[in-house]
Interface confidence: medium
């Protein structure tokens, strides 16, 4: 039938070591209130509960002050197991990584997860990526029809571990030049050799017709 | 948002049973203790079921073998399965976040801090 | 079982006042006590816990004293909308207990 507390003639147990730093104890219970700047932790062991005077909260708790008592408070901080206080976690439940009193599954953008420790340090910060450049190809920017164009951004700030790999920091892409031939009429040898194989395979193929019409035509009087 | 809605009460026959729930939305439910707390119309508060976070229950003597409460941490889902009902549990049925006698104090473990819109529940033939 | 006893079943007030309800537990409860007000056709809400811890968004208007078996909501200045009825609960030991409520009505 609940907990019915069997009170004690006596203020405090002194003797009793679950009486140490309450202001008022029970045998059955344990303190009801405790010093000055010490933490009172109610322990509930199923229906029965005692509580105790800390100097400090246990893991999983954080000391809260209060005006007419100091107590340990559960870390309501999702995937937490310790913390300093309502809000901000010191220690993550494994798997997780400590990112600013917070408990995250992997850590967000612009922070690495630094496992020997299970925390988000600061990664490698880059800048913005410049504009596209110039399409070109051999250093040329013309007598090709594909090129390159690349685009580069630059390292803000170092990772703080070497460890830690920095994004890419240059980056290119096939592009269409503007001047397929340069101007001045010059023309690359490879361009030059590119458009006499083009010129002698169009006469092979009109050649090819020719003759399949000629073979038609002379079946056809047979 | 913490939002709680109940759903399922209604009216039932002395020694029959009935089963409600309530849908929670806008916190990490399986990370918190959940309760039913019940309103006689009287307007007197009863305190009627926990279920901690690890999914240990408890209960008042006055419900204790005829009420059982569960949850489903997938669908974010409280239940109440009430029998051998009388009429003195003819009461609005309100489900609450926290109240978990199972863990140690805390900040809202032990008092309800978020409470739905109810469910009536009459007992009567 | 611990006992909460609200002595007042009502009180009357006027908006400006300041206005104390009261809640004896029968057994000292370690300041594990809260207050809940519930407004006319509304579910109860969590005002103040672990004795003087006031709750997310509750105005601090409202304030708890009190310590062993003996505690007090106080609203230091009443307003229109604080009309509703206020409840005790002891958090320390299970089962947990309600006071009877208190209904604070405006003049």
């Known amino acids: 039938q609940g907990n019915r507390w069997r009170r004690s003639k006596r203020a405090s147990y002194v003797s009793n070591p679950i009486c140490k730093g309450c202001l008022s104890c029970s045998k059955d219970n344990g303190c009801s209130r405790c010093q000055q700047k010490l933490f009172f932790f109610l322990r509930r062991e199923g229906m029965r509960q005692y509580g105790e005077c800390l100097h400090s909260c246990p893991s999983g708790y954080y000391g809260h002050r209060a005006p007419d008592m100091n107590r340990c408070a559960r870390c309501r901080i999702e995937n937490c197991d310790s913390c300093f206080s309502k809000d901000f976690c010191t220690k993550c439940k494994v798997g997780f990584y400590l990112h600013r009193g917070r408990c995250f599954d992997e850590c967000p953008d612009g922070f690495a997860p630094l496992e020997e420790t299970m925390e988000c340090v600061e990664g490698c910060e880059v800048g913005h990526w410049s504009e596209w450049g110039t399409c070109s190809r051999n250093n040329r920017t013309c007598g090709f029809k594909w090129g390159l164009e690349t685009r580069t951004r630059q390292i803000v700030k170092k990772p703080v571990k070497d460890t830690i790999l920095c994004p890419t920091i240059a980056e290119s892409r096939r592009c269409k030049m503007t001047m397929r031939h340069c101007p001045g009429g010059k023309r690359t040898p490879k361009a030059k050799e590119k458009r006499n194989k083009k010129k002698k395979r169009k006469l092979i193929e009109r050649a090819q017709e020719q003759h399949s019409v000629f073979l038609a035509t002379d079946r056809a009087n047979q | 948002e913490v939002k709680l809605v109940e759903s399922g009460g209604g009216l039932v026959k002395p020694g029959g049973s009935l089963k409600f729930s309530c849908a929670a939305s806008g916190f990490s439910f399986s990370s918190y203790a959940m309760s039913w707390v019940r309103q006689t119309p009287e307007k007197r508060l009863e305190w009627v079921a926990s279920i901690s976070s690890g999914g240990s229950t408890y209960y008042p003597d006055s419900v204790k073998g005829r009420f059982t409460i569960s949850r489903d941490n997938v669908r974010n889902i409280l239940y109440l399965q009430m029998s051998s009902l009388r009429s003195e549990d003819t009461a609005m049925y309100f489900c609450a976040r926290g109240g978990d006698p199972g863990v140690y104090n805390g900040d809202y473990e032990d008092a309800m801090d978020y409470w739905g819109q109810g469910t009536s529940v009459t007992v009567s033939s | 079982d611990i006992v909460m006893t609200q002595s007042h079943k009502f009180m009357s007030t006027s908006v400006g006042d300041r206005v104390s309800i009261t809640c004896k537990a029968s057994?000292?409860?370690?300041?594990?006590v809260a207050w809940y007000q519930q407004k006319p056709g509304q579910s109860p809400k969590l005002l103040i816990y672990w004795a003087s811890t006031r709750h997310t968004g509750v105005p601090d208007r409202f304030t708890n004293s009190g310590s062993g078996t003996d505690y007090t909501l106080t609203i230091s200045s009443v307003q229109a909308e604080d009309l509703a009825l206020y409840y005790c609960q002891q958090h320390y030991s299970t089962p947990w207990t309600f006071g009877g409520g208190t209904k604070l009505e405006i003049k």
């Open positions: 057994q000292d409860v370690s300041s594990a």
